[in-house]
């Protein structure tokens, strides 16, 4: 058993049918010595008396808010949560496996640049009685500071019969140098509590591996005289690291017809312009990627040919 | 990546082309190592990230773009020097182009070159003959060193008398390649910045 926060405790259980569970001793936080009784949650049934209460925690029915009283007055509370270990592996019931970029990916994180700021998000089908707390650091043995905000509900989607909820959090490394070569990964730890169930999820990454630039901005077309060709131009996104000559991007320019089946023409360039043939009803899209370290491509920025 | 490669014109900053080749070569070598050594811990998540140049060179600090010198987090142990020499500086004047930066890059390349050659000698003794260093990568390191044209004493190739542990050697190869790729990215960024200055 360990303390998650003041008066909230997590009991780790080897989870299988007929498991013996864990013996837990609760102590009433009071100078009083006698006349103390214990109850669980809203029930008025007295579970025991005395300054300590010994319980055998086996299932969720044994978890909850234990309260010690004296003469109708509440003295203190202890909330017991359960953390299930199923065949040597901690349970992952609360969050959905996003399966991208690989199986067992519960937390996904992205950074728009090398400033040390990044966003993580996760999915769940649970809508109520759910709380998250996020911590992060650079490295784990001698951790360096990363500050994370509160996790917030960022999107709701309907998937088949189920509603899916997306939560996200923004974090910022306390002293980040955009040009630094990372040797210790960022660690992100999310504590999730649903009703009386506790779970924790972790992700470990280098900022360089989660970079996804914003799409190029100010995408414009300039027709070339007496030609079906157009000059496409764009700019680096505002959120990208500077100077751009050091943090350079490379670009992919795509001409896509109305129908998804039509052949796509693609050109790769390090410049911020390109000359392409603009077909009728087609659209031109441009996306960006770090020129020297191949992390994710940005989303497409698009303009119609007409 | 099937990106078109821009060939620099002769007047252009001469080291840019070499540094681009270096990054391409080390990335290809790392990809090959990860595929060939699939049963070894060779992915970024599995290896320890060690930097053989740590405390010996200071490339990141010495080559920091001027715009980032205002960022205190980037200024741990920055010694700035604006003296320029070395053939890459081909008569281009800018306060950023410092000899310290380019000589630091040169020292990095020299250290990696020695490590890779020593390692290759060990890998050639492996009866499995599973993986060897790409000669093209070694050649590209050499070309960039020549383009930098710094004179420094030659580091003797390390020779080891004991029987090599091939498993450990292959894991060390992965560690070295990951670290060298990261350094090659920094070198490419620096050369691109110098070229634009």
């Amino acid at each position: 058993i360990w303390e998650l926060k003041k008066d909230v405790y997590v009991v780790e259980l080897d989870w299988y049918p007929d498991a013996p569970g864990e013996m837990v001793v609760l102590t009433c936080d009071t100078p009083e010595e006698d006349g103390i009784t214990w109850t669980l949650d809203q029930s008025s049934e007295v579970l025991g008396s005395g300054k300590t209460l010994t319980i055998q925690v086996k299932e969720f029915g044994d978890a909850g808010q234990y309260t010690c009283h004296k003469g109708g007055e509440v003295l203190s509370h202890s909330l017991l949560l359960l953390h299930k270990k199923e065949d040597g592996i901690w349970s992952t019931d609360i969050l959905k496996d996003q399966k991208e970029p690989k199986n067992k990916t519960f937390l996904r994180c992205e950074a728009k640049n090398y400033s040390g700021r990044f966003t993580c998000w996760w999915l769940t089908t649970i809508s109520t009685d759910l709380t998250f707390s996020v911590k992060s650091s650079r490295g784990s043995s001698d951790p360096q500071g990363v500050t994370c905000g509160a996790a917030t509900l960022s999107a709701e989607r309907v998937r088949g019969d189920n509603k899916e909820y997306e939560y996200s959090v923004e974090c910022q490394e306390d002293s980040a140098c955009p040009a630094a070569e990372e040797s210790l990964p960022i660690e992100v730890m999310v504590d999730a509590v649903h009703k009386l169930k506790y779970e924790n999820y972790t992700s470990s990454f280098f900022i360089r591996d989660i970079i996804k630039p914003d799409p190029p901005k100010n995408l414009q077309l300039k027709p070339l005289k007496n030609s079906r060709q157009v000059e496409v131009s764009w700019e680096y996104p505002d959120t990208w690291s500077t100077p751009h000559s050091y943090f350079s991007l490379t670009f992919c320019v795509q001409v896509q017809g109305k129908s998804k089946r039509e052949k796509k023409d693609r050109v790769f360039t390090d410049k911020t312009s390109a000359t392409v043939i603009c077909r009728k009803n087609a659209s031109i899209s441009v996306r960006a990627q770090d020129r020297y370290y191949s992390s994710s491509w940005s989303e497409w920025a698009s303009v119609p040919c007409s | 990546r099937n990106l078109p490669v821009a060939t620099p014109d002769p007047g252009m900053f001469p080291c840019l082309h070499h540094s681009q080749n270096l990054l391409r070569a080390v990335s290809n070598m790392l990809q090959k190592a990860r595929q060939t050594l699939e049963f070894y811990p060779c992915t970024s998540e599995e290896i320890d990230h060690e930097d053989i140049t740590k405390d010996k060179t200071s490339t990141v600090e010495a080559c920091l773009p001027l715009e980032l010198t205002k960022n205190e987090s980037c200024l741990n142990s920055r010694e700035t020097s604006f003296i320029t020499n070395g053939s890459c500086l081909a008569s281009r004047k800018t306060s950023f182009m410092m000899a310290l930066c380019l000589s630091s890059i040169y020292e990095d390349l020299k250290m990696y070159q020695v490590e890779f050659k020593t390692m290759n000698a060990k890998l050639l003794m492996d009866p499995k003959r599973q993986i060897f260093l790409d000669q093209n990568m070694l050649a590209v390191i050499d070309e960039l060193m020549q383009a930098l044209n710094f004179n420094s004493e030659t580091v003797p190739q390390k020779s080891s008398l004991e029987e090599p542990d091939f498993y450990k050697t292959k894991i060390k190869l992965c560690i070295l390649l990951h670290a060298f790729r990261i350094r090659a990215v920094t070198i490419d960024r620096v050369m691109s910045y110098l070229n634009a200055s």
């Epitope: 080897d14 989870w15 299988y16 049918p17 007929d18 498991a19 299932e59 969720f60 270990k85 199923e86 065949d87 040597g88 592996i89 019931d93 690989k102 199986n103 067992k104 089908t125 | 049963f39 811990p41 599995e46």
Partner: antibody, heavy 115, light 112 residues
Framework: QVQLVQSGGGVVQPGRSLRLSCAAS????????MHWVRQAPGKGLEWVAF????????YYADSVKGRFTISRDNSKNTLYLQMKSLRAEDTAVYYC????????WGQGTMVTVSS | SYVLTQPPSVSGTPGQRVTISCSGG????????VKWYQQLPGTAPKLLIY???QRPSGVPDRFSGSKSGTSASLAITGVQAEDEADYYC????????????FGTGTKVTVLG
């Protein structure tokens, strides 16, 4: 004590369907994940499928994906395996099993796919 | 399709020490715990070892398990006639959990 009693096995022709049941008693069935495992005659153990305690997630072996469906009725304390488009290579003893460091197995039920 | 490899058979005389190996990879045994089962003819498998080296109550202490790197082994110290059975190791793969990965199985024969 924990008991898993299986039923529903038998002889079936290729291409036909069969549903296996596993009735659980002696524990809070709705709190635990459950597996199906099979063993072809004279062969080793092969995992078939898994279902979470609440039925929210189901996982299948590639060899049965799209043909077999694992389900549970927590109000009846019963686990099911619906098997469709049966093939000769599905002939095996099928076991249900609890998920956990200490597991409990059903007695097994024989499924024979033969024309 | 078996990823965990066991020797097809091992044998020993009563009182001898018999060991069965189970060889896997970094993503399964290297990252997860190992179980061992005993299966007597015509019966369901019985758990012998969980969490690599833990014995459930009721399992004789002549059975012991160990794990090192990407391999695990089961030892029967002082093998007895009633130990003649098939033995299976089981683990998970970190990418496909909770799918069970079983070993190929080993037939233990007690001679004499």
């Amino acid at each position: 004590q924990v008991q898993l009693v299986q039923s529903g096995g038998g002889v079936v022709q290729p291409g036909r369907s069969l549903r296996l049941s596993c009735a659980a008693s002696g524990f809070t069935f709705s709190s635990y994940g459950m597996h199906w495992v099979r063993q072809a005659p004279g062969k080793g153990l092969e995992w078939v499928a898994f279902i979470r305690y609440d039925g929210s997630n189901k996982y299948y072996a590639d060899s049965v994906k799209g043909r077999f469906t694992i389900s549970r009725d927590n109000s009846k304390n019963t686990l099911y395996l619906q098997m469709k488009s049966l093939r000769a290579e599905d002939t095996a003893v099928y076991y249900c099993k609890t998920h956990g460091s200490h597991d409990n197995w059903g007695q097994g039920t024989m499924v024979t796919v033969s024309s | 399709s078996y990823v965990l490899t066991q020797p097809p058979s091992v044998s020993g005389t009563p009182g001898q020490r018999v060991t069965i190996s189970c060889s896997g990879g970094r993503s399964n045994i290297g990252s997860n715990t190992v179980k061992w089962y005993q299966q007597l003819p015509g019966t369901a498998p019985k758990l012998l070892i969980y969490w690599n080296d833990q014995r459930p109550s009721g399992v004789p202490d002549r059975f012991s398990g160990s794990k090192s790197g990407t391999s695990a082994s089961l030892a029967i110290t002082g093998v007895q006639a009633e130990d003649e059975a098939d033995y299976y190791c089981q683990s998970y793969d970190r990418g496909t959990h909770p799918a069970l990965l079983f070993g190929t199985g080993t037939k233990v024969t007690v001679l004499g």
